[in-house]
Interface confidence: medium
């Protein structure tokens, strides 16, 4: 199926930028792995590079505004021609759910005191209003709550006195049109506007003041332009050469608004001064290699020794990584393929242990399933032997850091009937549904 092809993928927002054009296949668009595509306008943007997980979205708002609730966040597998870690197809969302609490307590309503006395009338003639007030303290609200209804009420009051009405101008009427629209006519163009003393008219009894100033004004029409000439397009110029050596590019034709040139404020030519076409080199673009994550450290050993486990004897271990995805003469991965370090082996060593403090509460699991819970743990943590933290392996090569490696067998006193891990679980509350932000319903 044809797609919309773009020249850039914006990692931070997940949006396609720089529309190259539509009506091309995914395969042609993705000859250049820097490009991106959409299956339909406004749809999900997928980059042409090999798939990987996007950054996690920000946490959604807490599902309740007070007491304990839950909130979700997601990330999306984005890319083309492959899968993300976990053997997941591009377009898939992965979710995380955690507990949240915007405000510990929930608001409680208060109650009103009795009404206070009426204040004096707001005017000294004609009709006005008077007000009385009450306090929200019977009882006072709690935790940001309020009292239902209004803290004050008003009613009409009549002074039994007639007020005078002073005259005021209504707004100016519009300027009358100038007698000519271009300069150079026989008469000097003028424009006039008027207004009425009607907003309001002055009263007769008791007498109000008349409106101050004049009821009309006149002015000369200034800045009238010479009569305008509309612009017209010249012919299209030659098509520019294809600007790329691989993948899809964009060629351009141009024309000039000079047939004739617009004059005296006449309108510029309607339409575009340039038009573009997609050009296809049919050549795949180079793809640089990217390092996979480091592999596991190999066992900690010392040459010519059967085992150095549980002994103050430094050994060596290594780990490797693979340069993946390099195609069509792209750059090789920079840096080392192998990493070597010095180590003490504590693999399967019986070590004295101590119980850790409680860990922080973990994420709610499952994030998109029924009855999610969160957990925290106390672990039996091994006390590491006090071996030298650095060693000098070869004369004159300086000190090297030595790292403990391996899974020891820590021994702690029993805690709640457990020897290695004590776990506490809690249900997550007010859990929202996992909804795809791109496509709620397709």
């Amino acid at each position: 199926d044809p797609v919309l092809c773009f020249t850039q993928y914006e990692e931070s927002s997940g949006k396609c930028k720089g529309l190259l054009g539509g009506g091309v296949s995914v395969e042609d668009c993705c000859l250049n792995t820097a490009f991106a595509y959409q299956k339909r306008s406004g749809g999900l943007c997928q980059p042409c590079r090999s798939p990987r997980w996007s950054l996690w979205s920000t946490w959604a708002p807490c599902s309740v505004t007070c007491s304990e609730g839950s909130q979700l966040r997601y990330r999306r597998c984005v890319g083309w021609n492959g899968q993300c870690s976990g053997k997941v197809a591009p377009g898939t969302l992965e979710w995380q759910l955690q507990a949240c609490e915007d405000q510990q307590c929930c608001p409680e309503m208060g109650g009103w005191s009795g009404w206070g006395p009426w204040e004096p009338c707001s005017v000294t003639c004609s009709k006005g209003t008077r007000t009385r007030r009450r306090a929200c303290n019977h009882p006072a609200p709690k935790c940001g709550g309020h009292c239902p209804g209004q803290a004050q009420e008003s009613e009409a009051c009549d002074t039994q006195q007639v007020c005078p009405t002073h005259g005021a101008w209504a707004t100016w009427g519009p300027w009358t049109p100038c007698s000519a629209s271009c300069h150079g006519g026989p008469h000097e163009p003028k424009e006039t506007r008027s207004r009425k003393c009607s907003a309001p008219e002055p009263s007769q009894k008791p007498p109000g003041k008349p409106c101050p100033g004049l009821a009309y004004e006149q002015r000369r029409c200034t800045g009238l332009p010479p009569c305008p000439v509309a612009g017209g397009w010249g012919p299209w110029g030659p098509v520019s050469p294809c600007p790329v050596t691989c993948g899809l590019g964009q060629t351009m034709e141009q024309r000039t608004c000079n047939h004739p040139v617009p004059q005296h404020g006449g309108p510029f030519c309607a339409g575009d001064a340039t038009r573009t076409h997609i050009c296809n080199t049919a050549v795949p673009c180079p793809v640089d290699g990217e390092w996979d994550s480091w592999g596991e450290w190999s066992p900690c050993i010392r040459r010519n020794m059967k085992s150095i486990s549980c002994q103050e004897i430094p050994g060596q271990q290594s780990r490797g990584r693979t340069c993946r995805g390099r195609k069509f003469d792209g750059h090789r991965c920079a840096g080392q393929q192998q990493d070597i370090r010095h180590c003490y082996s504590i693999q399967h060593c019986p070590l004295k242990g101590s119980w850790s403090e409680w860990s922080t509460w973990g994420l709610c699991m499952p994030p998109c399933g029924p009855n999610p819970t969160r957990a925290r743990q106390r672990l039996c943590t091994p006390l590491l032997p006090k071996y030298p933290p650095t060693v000098s392996m070869v004369e004159g090569q300086g000190e090297k850091n030595v790292t403990f490696w391996g899974r020891p067998l820590p021994r702690c006193e029993e805690l709640q009937g457990q020897k290695l891990v004590v776990e506490e679980k809690r249900p997550c509350l007010h859990v929202p549904a996992c909804k795809d932000p791109e496509e709620e319903e397709l």
């Epitope: 999306r76 197809a89 377009g91 898939t92 969302l93 992965e94 795809d436 496509e439 319903e441």
Partner: nanobody, 129 residues
Framework: QVQLVESGGGLVQPGGSLRLSCATS????????MGWFRQAPGKEREFVAA????????YYAESVAGRFTISRDNAKSTVWLQMNSLKPEDTAVYYC??????????????????????WGQGTQVTVSG
């Protein structure tokens, strides 16, 4: 082990309606996402519709959107596919599928057969004048 049993297929005239049912047993139905797929003779299996465990998200293939509706009842451990305005090109064996990931979602996830862990035996739907 989860068992899925489809029913409700049959012969119907163009423009007619059918309601397929998929009854499940042997698992916690409320924690599964459920999907319907179909396979016509000599063609590849294709996605029809899917619903998440709460039924809060529903997804449809373009070819059936507006004509077919997927629904579920967690108390009855059953998912349905209501098919209206049927066309001859809807003729196929219809399969029900269940998926128990509670971590992933999205239209592209539920349209792939590899996503689902359990499948029914299928029910034949024939649309013919």
């Amino acid at each position: 082990q989860v068992q899925l049993v489809e029913s409700g297929g049959g012969l119907v005239q163009p423009g007619g309606s059918l309601r397929l049912s998929c009854a499940t047993s042997g698992g916690t139905f409320s924690s599964y996402a459920m999907g319907w797929f179909r396979q016509a003779p000599g063609k590849e299996r294709e996605f029809v519709a899917a619903t998440t465990w709460q039924g809060s998200n529903r997804y449809y293939a373009e070819s059936v959107a507006g004509r077919f509706t997927i629904s579920r009842d967690n108390a009855k451990s059953t998912v349905w596919l209501q098919m209206n305005s049927l066309k001859p090109e809807d003729t196929a064996v219809y399969y029900c599928a269940a998926e128990h990931s509670t971590r992933y979602s999205g239209f592209y996830y539920y349209t792939r057969g590899e996503t689902y862990h359990y499948w029914g035996q299928g029910t034949q739907v024939t649309v013919s004048g």
